[in-house]
Interface confidence: low
Protein backbone atom coordinates (compact mmCIF):
# COMPACT_ATOMS: atom_id res chain seq x y z
CA UNK A 1 0.00 0.00 0.00
CA UNK A 2 1.06 3.62 -0.47
CA UNK A 3 3.38 5.45 1.87
CA UNK A 4 1.54 6.46 5.04
CA UNK A 5 3.64 9.59 5.54
CA UNK A 6 2.28 10.86 2.25
CA UNK A 7 -1.15 9.68 3.33
CA UNK A 8 -0.85 11.70 6.57
CA UNK A 9 -3.58 9.62 8.17
CA UNK A 10 -5.78 10.91 10.99
CA UNK A 11 -8.44 9.25 13.08
CA UNK A 12 -11.97 10.67 12.97
CA UNK A 13 -12.08 10.15 16.75
CA UNK A 14 -9.12 10.22 19.17
CA UNK A 15 -8.84 7.28 21.54
CA UNK A 16 -6.64 6.10 24.38
CA UNK A 17 -5.80 2.52 25.28
CA UNK A 18 -4.56 0.95 28.49
CA UNK A 19 -4.23 -2.29 30.37
CA UNK A 20 -6.83 -2.46 33.14
CA UNK A 21 -6.46 -4.96 35.95
CA UNK A 22 -9.37 -6.67 37.65
CA UNK A 23 -8.35 -4.77 40.79
CA UNK A 24 -8.87 -1.48 38.90
CA UNK A 25 -12.10 -2.72 37.34
CA UNK A 26 -13.67 -4.37 40.38
CA UNK A 27 -17.08 -4.81 38.72
CA UNK A 28 -18.44 -5.19 35.20
CA UNK A 29 -21.71 -5.77 33.36
CA UNK A 30 -22.31 -9.25 32.00
CA UNK A 31 -24.31 -10.25 28.92
CA UNK A 32 -27.56 -10.43 30.86
CA UNK A 33 -27.05 -6.86 32.09
CA UNK A 34 -26.22 -7.90 35.65
CA UNK A 35 -23.36 -6.44 37.65
CA UNK A 36 -20.66 -8.99 38.48
CA UNK A 37 -17.42 -8.83 40.44
CA UNK A 38 -14.30 -9.42 38.35
CA UNK A 39 -11.92 -11.74 40.20
CA UNK A 40 -8.32 -10.57 40.45
CA UNK A 41 -6.76 -13.94 39.66
CA UNK A 42 -7.56 -16.94 37.53
CA UNK A 43 -6.45 -20.47 38.51
CA UNK A 44 -4.34 -22.11 35.82
CA UNK A 45 -2.42 -25.40 35.74
CA UNK A 46 0.74 -23.84 37.17
CA UNK A 47 -0.76 -21.52 39.77
CA UNK A 48 -2.62 -18.26 39.18
CA UNK A 49 -2.77 -15.63 36.46
CA UNK A 50 -3.55 -11.99 37.10
CA UNK A 51 -6.73 -11.09 35.21
CA UNK A 52 -6.49 -7.95 33.09
CA UNK A 53 -7.96 -6.42 29.97
CA UNK A 54 -6.88 -4.22 27.08
CA UNK A 55 -9.34 -1.33 26.95
CA UNK A 56 -9.77 1.51 24.47
CA UNK A 57 -12.02 4.51 24.95
CA UNK A 58 -12.54 8.00 23.58
CA UNK A 59 -9.82 10.40 24.67
CA UNK A 60 -11.46 12.98 26.97
CA UNK A 61 -8.46 15.27 26.44
CA UNK A 62 -8.42 14.81 22.67
CA UNK A 63 -9.21 17.26 19.90
CA UNK A 64 -12.39 15.34 19.09
CA UNK A 65 -14.13 15.71 22.44
CA UNK A 66 -16.42 18.36 20.87
CA UNK A 67 -17.26 16.25 17.81
CA UNK A 68 -15.65 14.08 15.17
CA UNK A 69 -12.83 15.22 12.90
CA UNK A 70 -13.50 15.75 9.19
CA UNK A 71 -17.31 15.71 9.28
CA UNK A 72 -19.45 17.72 6.86
CA UNK A 73 -20.89 20.11 9.46
CA UNK A 74 -23.43 21.59 7.06
CA UNK A 75 -25.37 18.34 7.07
CA UNK A 76 -24.39 16.43 10.20
CA UNK A 77 -23.95 16.71 13.95
CA UNK A 78 -21.33 14.28 15.22
CA UNK A 79 -20.11 12.77 18.44
CA UNK A 80 -17.24 10.47 19.36
CA UNK A 81 -18.55 7.59 21.40
CA UNK A 82 -16.85 4.76 23.25
CA UNK A 83 -18.14 1.39 22.08
CA UNK A 84 -18.00 -1.89 23.90
CA UNK A 85 -17.38 -5.50 23.17
CA UNK A 86 -17.51 -8.75 25.12
CA UNK A 87 -14.62 -10.68 26.61
CA UNK A 88 -14.65 -13.71 28.85
CA UNK A 89 -13.66 -13.17 32.46
CA UNK A 90 -13.76 -15.12 35.70
CA UNK A 91 -16.45 -13.40 37.73
CA UNK A 92 -18.69 -13.72 40.79
CA UNK A 93 -22.36 -12.80 40.63
CA UNK A 94 -24.59 -11.31 43.33
CA UNK A 95 -25.34 -14.82 44.64
CA UNK A 96 -21.59 -15.47 45.10
CA UNK A 97 -21.49 -17.95 42.21
CA UNK A 98 -18.11 -17.98 40.51
CA UNK A 99 -17.93 -18.69 36.81
CA UNK A 100 -16.65 -17.65 33.40
CA UNK A 101 -18.94 -15.01 31.94
CA UNK A 102 -18.71 -12.62 29.02
CA UNK A 103 -18.43 -9.07 30.31
CA UNK A 104 -18.57 -5.74 28.51
CA UNK A 105 -15.38 -3.77 28.15
CA UNK A 106 -14.55 -0.58 26.26
CA UNK A 107 -12.85 -1.47 22.98
CA UNK A 108 -13.09 1.47 20.62
CA UNK A 109 -14.00 5.07 19.95
CA UNK A 110 -16.24 5.58 16.92
CA UNK A 111 -18.07 8.50 15.38
CA UNK A 112 -21.86 8.65 15.35
CA UNK A 113 -23.86 11.08 13.23
CA UNK A 114 -27.27 12.73 13.46
CA UNK A 115 -28.71 14.58 10.51
CA UNK A 116 -29.09 18.34 10.87
CA UNK A 117 -32.74 19.36 10.72
CA UNK A 118 -34.32 22.54 9.34
CA UNK A 119 -31.85 23.38 6.61
CA UNK B 1 -25.73 0.68 26.12
CA UNK B 2 -28.76 1.99 24.23
CA UNK B 3 -29.21 1.40 20.52
CA UNK B 4 -27.91 4.33 18.45
CA UNK B 5 -30.34 3.56 15.62
CA UNK B 6 -33.19 4.25 18.02
CA UNK B 7 -31.75 7.67 18.71
CA UNK B 8 -31.77 8.39 14.99
CA UNK B 9 -28.02 7.97 14.89
CA UNK B 10 -25.89 6.67 12.07
CA UNK B 11 -22.41 5.26 12.29
CA UNK B 12 -19.67 6.83 10.20
CA UNK B 13 -18.58 3.28 9.33
CA UNK B 14 -20.79 0.20 9.02
CA UNK B 15 -19.62 -2.81 10.98
CA UNK B 16 -20.64 -6.39 11.53
CA UNK B 17 -20.19 -8.37 14.73
CA UNK B 18 -20.20 -12.11 15.24
CA UNK B 19 -19.22 -14.82 17.65
CA UNK B 20 -16.19 -16.66 16.32
CA UNK B 21 -15.23 -20.07 17.68
CA UNK B 22 -11.66 -21.26 18.07
CA UNK B 23 -12.51 -23.89 15.44
CA UNK B 24 -13.37 -21.10 12.98
CA UNK B 25 -10.35 -19.06 13.99
CA UNK B 26 -7.77 -21.82 14.13
CA UNK B 27 -4.79 -19.44 14.40
CA UNK B 28 -4.13 -15.93 15.67
CA UNK B 29 -1.28 -13.47 16.18
CA UNK B 30 0.03 -13.05 19.73
CA UNK B 31 1.63 -10.00 21.31
CA UNK B 32 5.10 -10.98 20.19
CA UNK B 33 3.87 -11.16 16.60
CA UNK B 34 4.05 -14.94 16.45
CA UNK B 35 1.32 -17.14 14.98
CA UNK B 36 -0.31 -19.38 17.57
CA UNK B 37 -2.98 -22.06 17.40
CA UNK B 38 -6.15 -21.21 19.31
CA UNK B 39 -7.33 -24.23 21.29
CA UNK B 40 -10.98 -25.20 20.86
CA UNK B 41 -11.64 -25.88 24.54
CA UNK B 42 -10.48 -24.53 27.87
CA UNK B 43 -10.32 -26.74 30.97
CA UNK B 44 -12.38 -25.36 33.86
CA UNK B 45 -13.23 -26.77 37.28
CA UNK B 46 -16.34 -28.56 35.99
CA UNK B 47 -15.06 -29.84 32.67
CA UNK B 48 -14.37 -27.86 29.52
CA UNK B 49 -15.56 -24.60 28.00
CA UNK B 50 -15.71 -23.94 24.29
CA UNK B 51 -13.40 -21.03 23.48
CA UNK B 52 -14.95 -18.29 21.39
CA UNK B 53 -14.65 -14.56 20.75
CA UNK B 54 -16.87 -11.60 19.97
CA UNK B 55 -15.43 -9.95 16.87
CA UNK B 56 -16.37 -6.76 15.06
CA UNK B 57 -15.06 -5.70 11.68
CA UNK B 58 -15.92 -3.35 8.84
CA UNK B 59 -18.87 -4.53 6.78
CA UNK B 60 -17.54 -5.38 3.31
CA UNK B 61 -21.09 -5.25 1.94
CA UNK B 62 -21.99 -2.00 3.70
CA UNK B 63 -22.65 1.46 2.28
CA UNK B 64 -19.33 2.64 3.69
CA UNK B 65 -17.05 0.24 1.82
CA UNK B 66 -16.12 3.11 -0.53
CA UNK B 67 -15.44 5.58 2.28
CA UNK B 68 -16.88 6.86 5.54
CA UNK B 69 -20.36 8.35 5.91
CA UNK B 70 -20.78 12.06 6.59
CA UNK B 71 -17.24 13.16 5.73
CA UNK B 72 -16.48 16.59 4.25
CA UNK B 73 -15.35 15.31 0.86
CA UNK B 74 -14.03 18.70 -0.24
CA UNK B 75 -11.20 18.43 2.26
CA UNK B 76 -10.80 14.76 3.13
CA UNK B 77 -10.42 11.28 1.67
CA UNK B 78 -11.72 8.63 4.04
CA UNK B 79 -11.57 4.93 4.62
CA UNK B 80 -13.29 2.56 7.04
CA UNK B 81 -10.73 0.36 8.70
CA UNK B 82 -11.01 -2.64 11.01
CA UNK B 83 -9.04 -2.11 14.22
CA UNK B 84 -7.81 -4.70 16.64
CA UNK B 85 -7.43 -5.27 20.33
CA UNK B 86 -6.03 -7.97 22.59
CA UNK B 87 -7.89 -10.69 24.43
CA UNK B 88 -6.54 -13.58 26.42
CA UNK B 89 -6.88 -17.03 24.91
CA UNK B 90 -5.58 -20.52 25.55
CA UNK B 91 -3.14 -21.14 22.73
CA UNK B 92 -0.34 -23.38 21.53
CA UNK B 93 2.81 -21.95 19.97
CA UNK B 94 5.01 -23.37 17.22
CA UNK B 95 6.99 -25.33 19.83
CA UNK B 96 3.77 -27.02 21.03
CA UNK B 97 3.80 -25.09 24.32
CA UNK B 98 0.29 -24.48 25.63
CA UNK B 99 -0.42 -21.32 27.58
CA UNK B 100 -2.64 -18.29 28.06
CA UNK B 101 -1.54 -15.56 25.69
CA UNK B 102 -3.01 -12.27 24.54
CA UNK B 103 -4.03 -12.55 20.90
CA UNK B 104 -5.21 -9.93 18.45
CA UNK B 105 -8.83 -9.95 17.42
CA UNK B 106 -10.90 -7.55 15.33
CA UNK B 107 -12.92 -5.31 17.64
CA UNK B 108 -14.11 -2.28 15.74
CA UNK B 109 -14.50 -0.40 12.47
CA UNK B 110 -13.27 3.18 12.57
CA UNK B 111 -12.83 5.92 10.01
CA UNK B 112 -9.40 7.22 9.05
CA UNK B 113 -8.86 10.41 7.08
CA UNK B 114 -6.25 11.72 4.71
CA UNK B 115 -6.21 15.36 3.72
CA UNK B 116 -6.95 16.14 0.08
CA UNK B 117 -3.93 17.69 -1.63
CA UNK B 118 -3.77 20.23 -4.42
CA UNK B 119 -6.93 22.19 -3.71
Amino acid sequence: HSDPARRGELSVCDSISEWVTAADKKTAVDMSGGTVTVLEKVPVSKGQLKQYFYETKCNPMGYTKEGCRGIDKRHWNSQCRTTQSYVRALTMDSKKRIGWRFIRIDTSCVCTLTIKRGR
Amino acid sequence: HSDPARRGELSVCDSISEWVTAADKKTAVDMSGGTVTVLEKVPVSKGQLKQYFYETKCNPMGYTKEGCRGIDKRHWNSQCRTTQSYVRALTMDSKKRIGWRFIRIDTSCVCTLTIKRGR
Epitope: S17, E18, W19, Y54, C109 | M31, R81, T82, Y86
Partner: antibody
Amino acid sequence: EVQLLESGGGLVQPGGSLRLSCAASVFTFSNYYMSWVRQAPGKGLEWVAGINWNGAGDTYYADSVKGRFTISRDNSKNTLYLQMNSLRAEDTAVYYCAKQGVTHYNPMDVWGQGTTVTVSS
Amino acid sequence: EIVMTQSPATLSVSPGDRATLSCRASQTVGSKLAWYQQKPGQAPRLLIYGARTRVAGIPDRFSGSGSGTEFTLTISSLQSEDFAEYYCQQYYDWPPLTFGGGTKVEIK
Protein backbone atom coordinates in the same frame (compact mmCIF):
# COMPACT_ATOMS: atom_id res chain seq x y z
CA GLU C 1 19.74 -6.69 19.22
CA VAL C 2 16.61 -4.55 18.89
CA GLN C 3 17.35 -1.56 16.68
CA LEU C 4 15.84 1.66 15.40
CA LEU C 5 17.57 3.54 12.61
CA GLU C 6 16.55 7.09 11.68
CA SER C 7 17.23 8.77 8.34
CA GLY C 8 16.10 11.78 6.35
CA GLY C 9 17.66 14.61 8.34
CA GLY C 10 19.51 17.47 6.71
CA LEU C 11 19.67 21.19 6.09
CA VAL C 12 16.44 22.90 5.05
CA GLN C 13 15.34 26.52 4.68
CA PRO C 14 12.66 28.04 6.95
CA GLY C 15 9.22 27.21 5.56
CA GLY C 16 10.57 24.06 3.91
CA SER C 17 9.66 20.41 4.42
CA LEU C 18 11.50 17.26 5.38
CA ARG C 19 10.46 13.67 5.95
CA LEU C 20 12.18 11.53 8.56
CA SER C 21 12.05 7.73 8.54
CA CYS C 22 12.77 5.25 11.30
CA ALA C 23 13.38 1.62 10.36
CA ALA C 24 12.80 -0.97 13.07
CA SER C 25 14.39 -4.39 13.29
CA VAL C 26 14.31 -7.44 15.56
CA PHE C 27 11.02 -6.65 17.31
CA THR C 28 7.37 -6.82 16.29
CA PHE C 29 7.05 -3.21 15.26
CA SER C 30 3.30 -3.41 14.62
CA ASN C 31 2.61 -4.13 18.32
CA TYR C 32 3.99 -0.95 19.77
CA TYR C 33 3.26 2.70 20.29
CA MET C 34 6.06 4.72 18.74
CA SER C 35 7.19 8.29 19.38
CA TRP C 36 9.48 10.98 18.02
CA VAL C 37 11.54 12.97 20.51
CA ARG C 38 13.86 15.84 19.67
CA GLN C 39 16.77 17.59 21.33
CA ALA C 40 17.80 21.11 20.32
CA PRO C 41 21.54 21.87 20.51
CA GLY C 42 22.61 22.10 24.15
CA LYS C 43 19.02 21.60 25.38
CA GLY C 44 16.93 18.87 26.96
CA LEU C 45 14.60 16.26 25.48
CA GLU C 46 11.23 17.26 24.01
CA TRP C 47 8.55 14.79 22.98
CA VAL C 48 7.22 15.65 19.51
CA ALA C 49 4.62 13.07 18.45
CA GLY C 50 3.31 9.57 19.09
CA ILE C 51 1.23 6.99 17.21
CA ASN C 52 -0.89 3.99 18.18
CA TRP C 53 -0.30 0.46 16.88
CA ASN C 54 -3.77 -0.80 16.14
CA GLY C 55 -4.70 0.69 12.78
CA ALA C 56 -7.06 3.34 14.16
CA GLY C 57 -4.79 6.15 13.02
CA ASP C 58 -4.56 7.59 16.54
CA THR C 59 -1.84 10.22 16.58
CA TYR C 60 -0.66 12.61 19.28
CA TYR C 61 1.36 15.83 18.96
CA ALA C 62 3.13 18.41 21.07
CA ASP C 63 1.50 21.85 20.76
CA SER C 64 4.70 23.23 19.25
CA VAL C 65 4.35 21.05 16.11
CA LYS C 66 0.58 20.54 15.85
CA GLY C 67 -0.69 21.27 12.35
CA ARG C 68 2.82 21.25 10.88
CA PHE C 69 4.10 17.73 11.58
CA THR C 70 2.45 14.40 10.76
CA ILE C 71 3.47 11.11 12.35
CA SER C 72 2.57 7.91 10.52
CA ARG C 73 3.69 4.33 10.20
CA ASP C 74 3.82 1.50 7.71
CA ASN C 75 3.69 -1.73 9.68
CA SER C 76 4.32 -3.79 6.54
CA LYS C 77 7.68 -2.03 6.19
CA ASN C 78 8.43 -1.80 9.95
CA THR C 79 8.88 1.93 9.45
CA LEU C 80 7.85 5.05 11.35
CA TYR C 81 7.69 8.45 9.63
CA LEU C 82 7.63 12.11 10.57
CA GLN C 83 6.54 14.51 7.86
CA MET C 84 7.68 18.00 8.83
CA ASN C 85 6.20 21.00 7.01
CA SER C 86 6.51 24.78 7.53
CA LEU C 87 9.81 24.26 9.32
CA ARG C 88 11.12 26.97 11.64
CA ALA C 89 14.56 27.75 13.05
CA GLU C 90 13.38 26.46 16.44
CA ASP C 91 12.77 23.00 14.92
CA THR C 92 16.55 22.59 14.59
CA ALA C 93 17.41 19.52 16.65
CA VAL C 94 18.48 15.91 16.70
CA TYR C 95 15.34 13.82 16.15
CA TYR C 96 15.09 10.41 17.79
CA CYS C 97 12.47 7.75 17.24
CA ALA C 98 11.62 5.64 20.26
CA LYS C 99 9.63 2.48 20.96
CA GLN C 100 7.14 2.50 23.80
CA GLY C 101 4.82 -0.33 24.78
CA VAL C 102 1.57 -1.91 23.67
CA THR C 103 -0.09 1.15 25.19
CA HIS C 104 1.22 4.66 25.56
CA TYR C 105 1.43 4.15 29.33
CA ASN C 106 4.97 2.86 28.91
CA PRO C 107 8.45 4.40 28.94
CA MET C 108 10.66 4.58 25.86
CA ASP C 109 12.75 1.46 26.14
CA VAL C 110 14.47 1.52 22.74
CA TRP C 111 15.86 4.62 20.98
CA GLY C 112 17.40 5.22 17.60
CA GLN C 113 20.76 6.96 17.22
CA GLY C 114 19.09 10.18 16.00
CA THR C 115 19.11 12.22 12.79
CA THR C 116 20.00 15.90 12.67
CA VAL C 117 17.63 18.50 11.24
CA THR C 118 18.99 22.01 10.67
CA VAL C 119 16.59 24.78 9.67
CA SER C 120 18.52 27.78 8.43
CA SER C 121 18.60 30.22 5.55
CA GLU D 1 0.39 19.58 30.88
CA ILE D 2 2.45 18.02 33.67
CA VAL D 3 5.65 19.97 34.26
CA MET D 4 8.68 17.98 35.43
CA THR D 5 11.36 19.83 37.38
CA GLN D 6 14.78 18.32 38.05
CA SER D 7 17.31 19.46 40.62
CA PRO D 8 20.09 20.26 40.80
CA ALA D 9 20.88 21.29 37.21
CA THR D 10 24.49 20.19 37.77
CA LEU D 11 25.85 17.80 40.36
CA SER D 12 29.61 17.61 40.99
CA VAL D 13 30.58 14.29 42.53
CA SER D 14 33.79 12.38 43.08
CA PRO D 15 34.12 8.83 41.71
CA GLY D 16 33.00 6.32 44.35
CA ASP D 17 30.66 8.82 46.01
CA ARG D 18 26.89 8.69 46.14
CA ALA D 19 24.77 10.88 43.85
CA THR D 20 21.15 11.80 44.55
CA LEU D 21 19.09 13.35 41.76
CA SER D 22 15.61 14.77 42.32
CA CYS D 23 12.61 15.06 40.06
CA ARG D 24 9.34 16.77 40.94
CA ALA D 25 6.04 16.60 39.02
CA SER D 26 3.58 19.51 39.02
CA GLN D 27 0.78 17.00 39.68
CA THR D 28 0.65 13.33 40.51
CA VAL D 29 2.08 10.87 38.00
CA GLY D 30 1.53 7.83 40.23
CA SER D 31 4.49 5.57 39.56
CA LYS D 32 4.57 6.28 35.81
CA LEU D 33 8.02 7.79 35.90
CA ALA D 34 11.16 6.84 33.98
CA TRP D 35 14.82 7.84 34.29
CA TYR D 36 17.14 8.06 31.28
CA GLN D 37 20.88 8.44 30.98
CA GLN D 38 22.41 10.32 28.06
CA LYS D 39 26.08 10.62 27.22
CA PRO D 40 27.40 13.28 24.79
CA GLY D 41 26.68 12.38 21.16
CA GLN D 42 24.55 9.39 22.13
CA ALA D 43 20.84 8.64 22.34
CA PRO D 44 19.17 8.46 25.75
CA ARG D 45 19.08 5.06 27.45
CA LEU D 46 16.28 3.89 29.74
CA LEU D 47 17.54 3.07 33.24
CA ILE D 48 14.48 2.95 35.49
CA TYR D 49 10.74 2.72 34.81
CA GLY D 50 7.72 2.52 37.08
CA ALA D 51 9.68 4.86 39.39
CA ARG D 52 11.73 2.00 40.85
CA THR D 53 12.13 -0.91 38.41
CA ARG D 54 15.61 -1.25 36.94
CA VAL D 55 15.89 -2.23 33.28
CA ALA D 56 17.63 -5.56 32.65
CA GLY D 57 21.38 -5.05 32.38
CA ILE D 58 21.46 -1.81 34.39
CA PRO D 59 23.87 -2.10 37.36
CA ASP D 60 22.29 -2.29 40.81
CA ARG D 61 24.10 0.85 41.93
CA PHE D 62 21.25 2.67 40.16
CA SER D 63 18.02 2.81 42.15
CA GLY D 64 14.81 4.78 41.87
CA SER D 65 12.30 5.74 44.54
CA GLY D 66 9.25 7.89 45.11
CA SER D 67 5.67 8.10 43.88
CA GLY D 68 3.09 10.75 43.23
CA THR D 69 5.03 13.97 42.72
CA GLU D 70 8.47 13.42 44.31
CA PHE D 71 11.06 11.07 42.84
CA THR D 72 14.72 10.30 43.38
CA LEU D 73 17.40 8.56 41.33
CA THR D 74 20.31 7.37 43.45
CA ILE D 75 23.67 6.20 42.14
CA SER D 76 25.26 4.53 45.14
CA SER D 77 28.90 4.59 44.07
CA LEU D 78 29.70 6.59 40.97
CA GLN D 79 31.82 4.93 38.32
CA SER D 80 33.60 6.83 35.55
CA GLU D 81 31.01 5.67 33.00
CA ASP D 82 28.16 7.18 35.08
CA PHE D 83 29.17 10.79 34.42
CA ALA D 84 26.41 11.90 32.04
CA GLU D 85 23.14 13.80 31.76
CA TYR D 86 20.07 12.26 33.46
CA TYR D 87 16.44 12.96 32.56
CA CYS D 88 13.21 12.02 34.26
CA GLN D 89 10.02 11.61 32.23
CA GLN D 90 6.37 11.08 33.11
CA TYR D 91 4.12 8.82 31.06
CA TYR D 92 1.07 9.07 33.30
CA ASP D 93 -0.88 11.75 31.45
CA TRP D 94 -0.33 12.55 27.82
CA PRO D 95 -0.24 14.07 25.34
CA PRO D 96 2.20 15.52 25.92
CA LEU D 97 4.80 13.19 27.37
CA THR D 98 7.02 15.49 29.40
CA PHE D 99 10.67 15.34 30.42
CA GLY D 100 12.52 17.14 33.18
CA GLY D 101 15.19 19.67 32.19
CA GLY D 102 17.98 17.24 33.07
CA THR D 103 20.71 16.93 35.68
CA LYS D 104 24.32 16.84 34.57
CA VAL D 105 26.49 14.65 36.78
CA GLU D 106 30.09 15.79 36.43
CA ILE D 107 33.40 14.82 37.98
CA LYS D 108 34.32 16.90 41.01
